[in-house]
């Protein structure tokens, strides 16, 4: 089975890698644009020049093309926490990311917010920070894992599913309770 | 005491719009990010859509962009979501929740609203 090409990878499968066809008339290839650049005019002719422009202040192309228009840079999310890692250039878009002891949390595919990295307070540091994934902490004893944070044991109601991981302390407080009122 | 105040769910065919509503008290609405989130029958809670604390910036989830608008009036404390060509996997009960500062978890959310999406 050959796979469903597009109108525009169909045109484009004709000519040699780096060249187009030509809208207008399929019997030309046109050179593709560098990154940085877009597509002005089409060549006028085999082996004649295609136009390309560079792109404006704001845009960019990050491979070579035929689009009529640059696209337009990325602007990191303040309010999700993001900061700008390296700006837009013609031939790059703006790399948006976390601040140091931060991680990305993926809403969805193109959204991410920055939250910092948990510290492990009462606990030992399992798996370290990631770009993408806060740490893993282990907790010490008298202590379990609620969202990532090591609460104590005193606050293990029985229903929860910590009681496994606080058993001995549970039972030791109903005991000294118990010592208490004999 | 943070209160979230979820209306105007209901039984729509496929294809309808539904207008949710959410109540705030308790708080300062106008300096929050506020969000709602979904869980469908079975499935675990998903995020849908957030809107910045004065209104400017909103976000959605891939599965509802194009259909649903996130809206709010700071004035009456209240936060919208305007839900257009609804599918049946749209089905759900939605809650409105302030949008997480610290951590990835939802902290405060309502008692949620059910949306029937069905012929």
């Known amino acids: 089975l050959v796979p469903h090409l597009g109108d525009r990878e169909k045109r484009d499968s004709v000519c040699p890698q780096g060249k187009y066809i030509h809208p207008q008339n399929n019997s030309i290839c046109c050179t593709k644009c560098h990154k940085g650049t877009y597509l002005y005019n089409d060549c006028p002719g085999p082996g004649q020049d295609t136009d390309c422009r560079e792109c404006e202040s704001g845009s960019f192309t990050a491979s070579e093309n035929h689009l009529r228009h640059c696209l337009s840079c990325s602007k990191c999310r303040k309010e999700m926490g993001q900061v700008e890692i390296s700006s837009c250039t013609v031939d790059r878009d703006t790399v948006c990311g976390c601040r140091k002891n931060q991680y990305r949390h993926y809403w969805s595919e193109n959204l991410f917010q920055c939250f910092n990295c948990s510290l492990c307070l009462n606990g030992t540091v399992h798996l370290s920070c990631q770009e993408k994934q806060n740490t893993v902490c282990t907790c010490h004893a008298g202590f379990f894992l609620r969202e990532n944070e090591c609460v104590s044991c005193s606050n293990c109601k029985k229903s929860l599913e910590c009681t496994k991981l606080c058993l001995p302390q549970i039972e030791n407080v109903k005991g000294t309770e118990d010592s208490g009122t004999t | 005491e943070v209160q979230l105040l979820e209306s105007g769910g209901g039984l729509v065919q496929p294809g309808g719009s539904l207008r949710l509503s959410c109540a705030a008290s308790?708080?300062?609405?106008?300096?929050?990010?506020m969000a709602w989130v979904r869980q469908a029958p079975g499935k675990g809670l998903e995020w849908v859509s957030t809107?910045?604390?004065?209104?400017?910036?909103?976000y959605y989830a891939d599965s509802v962009k194009g259909r649903f608008t996130i809206s709010r009036d700071n004035s009456k404390n209240t936060l919208y979501l305007q839900m257009n060509s609804l599918r049946a996997e749209d089905t759900a009960v939605y809650y409105c929740?302030?949008?997480?500062?610290?951590?990835?978890?939802?902290?405060?959310w309502g008692q949620g609203t059910l949306v029937t999406v069905s012929s």
């Open positions: 308790g708080f300062t609405f106008p300096e929050y990010g």
């Open positions: 809107i910045s604390h004065g209104g400017e910036h909103t």
């Open positions: 929740a302030q949008h997480p500062v610290s951590h990835p978890k939802f902290d405060y």
